[in-house]
Interface confidence: low
């Protein structure tokens, strides 16, 4: 009698099922009893002699590739032995490399959590998955894995992670880079310091006196707000950073505590007072401001 | 076997937006990337965009990046596709579509999203 | 983005004869690392979904049958239909997937 092994599917993609068969055309199983054994390479599969002549493979990987036979036994001890079956396990490459960050749209507060996930569209078995910074490409990390997707994490980001980053999949035919990402480092405003710049040492009543207020960390835009006490005098946008200045004309009112505030839409700042004192110094004829 | 059932037609007066589910039934969710395409009364298949479910990470089709925001909920094996701004030339058949290996093999049974004034 | 051109826009073709409709893409879907094309192709009847036909050019999906046949490399692309059947009238779409997907324009495939 003779035995024929049968794979199904014959040619079988990484990660799928194949079931081996143990066919035996000219004997019916009522014929005789018979015990199966199936075989890759020199080793014994599964659970080695079974009453079943079928073997399920859950899954199959590229180092499955090999050749496969199979046994029969009867109860009076005679063996039949398949002829060799050579089976193939192909290998899908990667294909459409992306890389997508969490949070999405890779805007990330300042000492946030920012997840790169490089993912692919299609490949198969172990895939390395490997993390650059920079056009020029330095080497962040790299992942093995039997997964489309991989993730690097910066758990703590500095305002120096501010980058375009990429990633690259590979899985034995070659690296597959996905586009660049660029990542936006958002930082909450510093508590802003207030300047009172006047034309001379000492301002007098019409002088014009420059507030000057300037956060000097913080992503821009900011926006900054003038106060003369708790009244507000008015606002200056920085657009693209920096401080602002705001022009008072001096009148004997404008003595007081003068502040400013600086937001960025992540936090608003409010800088120390600073006090402006209208005095008479002796012998002249008009009023000073002295701060 | 696998299921891809689409959210029922939808008729929007133009500026609105619509959202169109697609639940996935059969295989598992985040193990397949879901794209969404779209066909105009007598016209041809135009993609719009995809959803990697297990990492959340889209890629969109740059004629629809402004309008289109494509989500998936992992817990419900559900993939969203949401358009907004829409105008009468949006009047279609929106598809949902599994891929495997690049190809898409299972496709939803299509909602006709109808803009009119 | 890859330009998919497909060949006649409409075809009409006797009952038992062969049918043959041509794609070109804009630039080459072959792999040279696994000498395999990212092109598919659909079938699409009226108020129906497309039905994924083919991919990797050349492989039959399962369950469809044997008369239909994905021919072609690099940039030049076939779908043959050896047998035109009743229930083959439809629309024909190619695709490709090497990068985001864009897809052929469709042809027509009628009876004569």
């Known amino acids: 009698a003779e035995l024929f092994l049968i794979a199904s599917p014959s040619h079988p993609t990484e990660g799928s099922p194949v079931t081996l068969t143990c066919k035996m055309p000219f004997l019916q199983s009522s014929d005789a009893q018979f015990q199966f054994c199936f075989f890759r390479d020199t080793r014994a599969l599964g659970p080695g002699w079974s009453s079943s002549p079928k073997l399920q493979i859950a899954a199959m990987w590229k180092e499955d590739t090999g050749s496969y036979w199979c046994e029969a036994q009867t109860m009076a001890s005679k063996v039949l032995r398949s002829r060799r079956s050579q089976i193939n396990v192909h290998r899908v490459p990667v294909a459409d490399v992306s890389l997508e960050t969490q949070p999405p749209g890779g805007q990330v507060m300042e000492g946030d959590r920012l997840v790169l996930i490089c993912s692919v569209a299609m490949g198969t078995g172990d895939i390395t998955f490997l993390w650059y910074k920079g056009a020029v490409g330095l080497n962040l990390q790299s992942k093995t894995q039997r997964s489309l997707t991989a993730e690097y994490e910066i758990p703590s980001v500095r305002e120096s992670d501010a980058e375009q980053y990429y990633c690259v999949a590979e899985n034995g035919y070659g690296p597959s880079p996905s586009g660049l990402v660029s990542i936006t480092v958002r930082i909450p405003v510093s508590r802003p310091i207030l300047m009172l710049r006047a034309p001379r040492a000492q301002a007098a009543v019409e002088d014009v006196l420059e507030l000057h207020c300037e956060a000097l960390r913080g992503s821009p835009p900011i926006l900054y707000w003038f106060y003369h006490e708790d009244i507000t005098l008015g606002s200056r946008s920085a657009p693209s950073g920096g401080g602002a200045s705001f022009n008072l004309s001096l009148t004997e009112e404008h003595s007081g505590n003068y502040s400013c505030e600086a937001n960025n839409g992540l936090g608003a700042q409010r800088s120390e007072a600073v006090t402006l004192n209208f005095t008479v110094p002796t012998g002249a004829r008009s009023n000073h401001l002295t701060s | 076997q696998v299921q891809l059932v689409q959210s029922g037609a939808e008729v929007k007066k133009p500026g609105a937006s619509v959202k169109v589910s697609c639940k996935a039934s059969?295989?598992?969710?985040?193990?397949?990337?879901m794209h969404w395409v779209r066909q105009a009364p007598g016209q041809g298949l135009e993609w719009m965009g995809r959803?990697?479910?297990?990492?959340?990470?889209?890629k969109y089709n740059e004629k629809f990046k402004s309008r289109v925001t494509i989500t998936a909920d992992t817990s419900t094996s559900t993939a969203y596709m949401e358009l907004s701004s829409l105008r009468s030339e949006d009047t279609a058949v929106y598809y949902c579509a599994r891929v495997n290996s690049g190809a898409m093999d299972y496709w939803g049974q299509g909602t006709l999203v109808t803009v009119s004034s | 983005d890859i330009v998919m051109t497909q060949s006649p826009d409409s075809l009409a073709v006797s009952l038992g004869e062969r049918a043959t409709i041509n794609c070109k893409s804009s630039?080459?879907?072959?792999?040279?690392?696994?000498?395999?094309?990212?092109l598919a192709w659909y079938q699409q009847k009226p108020g129906q979904p497309p039905k994924l036909l083919i991919y990797?050019?050349?492989t039959r999906e399962s369950g469809v049958p044997d008369r239909f046949s994905g021919s072609g490399s690099g940039t030049d692309f076939t779908l043959t239909i050896s047998s035109l059947q009743a229930e083959d009238v439809a629309v024909y779409y190619c695709?490709?997937?090497?990068?985001?997907?864009?897809f052929g324009q469709g042809t027509k495939v009628e009876i004569k």
């Open positions: 695709q490709q997937y090497s990068n985001y997907p864009t």
């Open positions: 630039q080459s879907l072959l792999y040279s690392s696994n000498q395999k094309n990212y």
């Open positions: 059969g295989y598992t969710f985040t193990r397949y990337w």
């Open positions: 990797w050019a050349s």
């Open positions: 959803i990697d479910p297990n990492s959340g990470g889209s």
